[in-house]
């Protein structure tokens, strides 16, 4: 190889060891029998050398640095050449570095021809191995603007006081042009301006200077976004840190065409604007930091540009002004991430503050719109608390647990509507009365409706799940001892059509000691399946539950248990079951931890089934499943 650098070219070539391939033996640059691992060639020098190995690209890298001085004379503006030409260089990983020094008052603009650049974060690499590292200067301090790959949106970067651009090319890459030009501009009066051009839908992730380290103190950096007028842009902050400010405040400012309040100023922790039509600017302004404990300011954000959806022009009013203790959250439903570009899916408050999730609270009227290609990507979760603090005022008071029509009219599927029902301890209990009798969901008879009610204790220390219930069964009411949450969970979009079937009334009733009482009025046509609460995890220790089962005068009920033994093993106390005829008060008592469960039994009158648990040993829990079937009395049962 021969490298000859013209005099006055201000080019230095450095060949040095890269990261060695550990299993290989060292490779050397050989110059007239001398073996060396580093070779520096300066302007005006000509050097002939060879390598001592077959694959020097596995050992060495080459750096070609050109110093461009715009301080003492005119600047060579225009398209930047690769000098020396890549064809004259050994096939090593190459880094071309252009170091441009200019006066503070002169702006320098790097213009990137297509393909434009895409910024990458720490630890990321470019698929083709071609990277552009760009840094600027504040006095004597070097500031990293960022590292970029090809195929992005960044078209221009403006700086002042100098710029250092490093283009890294892998040894096998055929590229022989720099892909950028330098132009002079008037002073930009800030650290830098990055222009990002969108031709169509897409996204760009960008970072503050020096990211992930701190943005320089009291500096200003601007991003200019060029967006076709028919598209919409939304900004979301992926990662940010604030420093400790002594004077001024760290902030972002937006210049949004058409806005009457330009510049719009936001804190970094605010929701950032979305649904913006056309071009806009975003600026990051630092502050004077505390000298003792400066902290760091850094920002990584994403701009998503997409077609406005039909929904984005529709405003939905969610009137929660008459509601109390209620919150509504619209959020993305969990999905597997795909690698291809997925347009954003945002919900916007007052059409401008858009984010991927939004929580509305009671007491106000909210105007929302959607910026989303497919609203099935979102769902809605609502929580409402109904609490009674004064037992004298609440007793016998009833509340309808009904999803408000405002919510049902939104174009987003309702996932959960949870009512938290709170009562004063040991003073009142609750009764749930459905508009339509309920069926308990079991493996033997699953619910196939578009929604269910999930009933669970709302006492933090108590792990008690009564079960999942849907309309169309035999459970007439559910009484519970203390605080519970009732969640209406939807399973199909057809819930909108079936919404009329929902309806549950809760009443506050005098306190009782049992954890729960289910009132069951079986129909003659079907078998009723019932199971103990906390199925699969076992009825909690020392918990008692009852079923009040009605038997019509002309019917006989067959009570069947689906196991021979309960399987419970008691650590302390006894687990037992009482089956009691309501008319005669005659009762049978079974020791669940000792006896076998009763064989199918026939009941001519209404009866109680009461199950009380002991403190079981772990792994030997109490789970019981039983059924009740009605048959006409005329059938000979012998």
């Amino acid at each position: 190889f021969e490298i000859a650098l013209p005099r006055e070219s201000n080019i230095t070539v450095l060949i040095k060891l890269g990261t060695p391939t550990l299993l290989a033996k060292p490779c050397y640059i050989v110059i007239s029998k001398r073996h060396i691992t580093m070779l520096s060639i300066k302007s005006g020098e000509r050097i002939v050398f060879t390598f001592s190995c077959q694959s020097p690209e596995n050992h060495f890298v080459i750096e070609i640095q050109k110093n461009i001085d715009c301080m003492s004379g005119p600047c060579p503006f225009g398209e930047v050449q690769l000098q020396p030409s890549t064809s004259l260089l050994p096939t090593l990983n190459r880094t071309f570095i252009w170091d441009v020094k200019a006066h503070k008052s002169i702006g320098l603009e790097l213009q990137f021809s297509i393909p434009r650049l895409r910024q990458i974060g720490p630890g990321e690499s470019c698929p083709d191995g071609v990277t552009h590292s760009i840094s600027g200067r504040i006095d004597a301090t070097v500031v990293r603007i960022g590292t970029f790959c090809s195929n992005g949106t960044v078209s221009r970067i403006k700086m002042q006081e100098g710029v250092k651009m490093a283009l890294h090319l892998p040894w096998f890459h055929p590229r022989n042009v720099s892909g950028f030009s330098i132009a002079n501009r008037s002073s930009i009066k800030r650290l830098c301006i990055i222009e990002s051009v969108f031709e169509g839908e897409g996204s760009a992730t960008l970072m503050s200077a020096n990211y992930p380290e701190g943005f320089p103190e009291d500096e200003l950096m601007t991003w200019q976004f060029v967006v076709p007028a028919h598209l919409r842009a939304s900004v979301s902050f992926l990662n940010f840190n604030l420093s400790n400010c002594e004077r001024k405040e760290e902030r972002v400012e937006y210049y949004i065409p058409g806005s009457t309040t330009n510049p719009e100023v936001f804190k970094l922790e605010d929701k950032q604007p979305g649904n913006m039509a056309g071009n806009f600017n975003l600026s990051l302004q630092g502050c004077d930091q505390d000298a003792q404990s400066p902290g760091i300011l850094r920002l990584q954000f994403q701009v998503l540009v997409q077609h406005p959806q039909n929904e984005s022009n529709k405003i939905y009013v969610v009137d929660l002004s008459n509601e109390r203790a209620m919150s509504l959250t619209i959020e993305p439903r969990p999905v597997k991430q795909s690698r291809k570009f997925v347009p954003g899916c945002f919900v916007c408050l007052e059409s401008r503050t858009c984010s991927s999730n939004l929580t509305l609270t009671s007491g106000s009227k909210h105007k929302i719109s959607f910026l989303c290609d497919d609203l099935t990507r979102l769902w809605m979760n609502v929580e409402k608390t109904i609490s009674c603090t004064d037992h004298r005022y609440c007793q016998r008071k009833s509340y309808s647990l009904q999803v408000p029509s405002d919510i049902l009219h939104l174009p987003v599927e309702l996932h959960d509507f949870s009512w938290k029902l709170l009562v004063p301890k040991d003073r009142l209990s609750l009764v749930l009365v459905p508009a339509q009798k309920l069926q308990q969901h079991t493996h033997e008879k699953p619910c196939n409706t578009s929604f269910s009610y999930l009933v669970a204790s709302a006492i933090p220390s108590q792990d008690l799940y009564f079960g999942s219930f849907c309309p169309g069964g035999s459970i007439k009411q559910i009484q519970v001892k203390q605080n519970i949450s009732v969640t209406l969970r939807t399973f199909a979009p057809s819930f909108q059509q079936e919404a009329s079937r929902q309806g549950l009334t809760v009443s506050f009733i005098p306190y009782f000691k049992e954890e729960g009482v289910f009132t069951v009025t079986p129909d003659t046509k079907s078998k009723v399946y019932l199971r103990t609460p906390n199925w699969d995890r076992g009825l909690p220790s020392l918990t008692s539950v009852s079923w009040n089962i009605s038997v019509p005068r002309d019917q006989v009920a067959c009570l069947t248990f689906f196991k021979e033994r309960s399987g419970v093993v008691c650590q302390t106390g006894r687990a037992f079951m009482i089956i009691q005829e309501q008319r005669t008060r005659a009762e049978e008592i079974f020791s669940l931890d000792e006896d076998v469960l009763p064989k199918p039994s026939f009941h001519h009158h209404s009866f109680w089934v009461n199950i009380s648990n002991c403190s079981p040993t772990s792994g030997k829990q109490l789970d019981l499943l039983f059924s009740v079937t009605l048959t006409p009395r005329t059938v000979d049962l012998t």
Partner: antibody, heavy 116, light 106 residues
Framework: QVQLVQSGAEVKKPGSSVKVSCKAS????????MNWVRQAPGQGLEWIGW????????IYDPKFQGRATITADESTSTAYMELSSLRSEDTAVYYC?????????WGQGTLVTVSS | EIVLTQSPATLSLSPGERATLSCSAS?????LYWYQQKPGQAPRPWIY???NLASGVPARFSGSGSGTDFTLTISSLEPEDFAVYYC?????????FGGGTKVEIK
Amino acid sequence: QVQLVQSGAEVKKPGSSVKVSCKASGFNIKDYYMNWVRQAPGQGLEWIGWIDPENANTIYDPKFQGRATITADESTSTAYMELSSLRSEDTAVYYCYGSSYRFTYWGQGTLVTVSS
Amino acid sequence: EIVLTQSPATLSLSPGERATLSCSASSSVSYLYWYQQKPGQAPRPWIYLTSNLASGVPARFSGSGSGTDFTLTISSLEPEDFAVYYCQQWSSNPFTFGGGTKVEIK
């Protein structure tokens, strides 16, 4: 397992030559530079030179150029170092070692005594 | 040629103490290698490529440095660490060794 076994101790007269051998096992000498160093009694290590068995290229410390000859026989995985015009100050333990970026395998050493 | 100067020539320390061995090059070196030698034995590879421990070398050893100044550090000396340590450069032939540092028991 990797080993470099050197030939036995030699006693030589001044002005004569000595040829020390170094047989490698457990690795391919083509993948290593085969170096020779020496250590005079109570002294430090002194690099003599190497051979690249892949292409038979050799390098010597200028101090030993013309007096030391390093060769290698790939077929027997053996490296040799011959030192001519011996003088009493050449009395030392001569070590061979194979080197790559990561691994360095050393022989046990051969004591060469030059005495009249 | 590149001259490597090791200092100190002798380091007298007690077990449990920290040892810092220095190797200074007369011109810039890409990587440095360290070897340990005990009396009557061949040198053993100890640190390769400036900072990587050779196989079997305890983690109390570390290597650092760049350019012309390199260091081998033993965080807490064990009895088996008392030996002579040599540095060697592979950046430019002849591939010289330092004069060695003897770490002896105080």
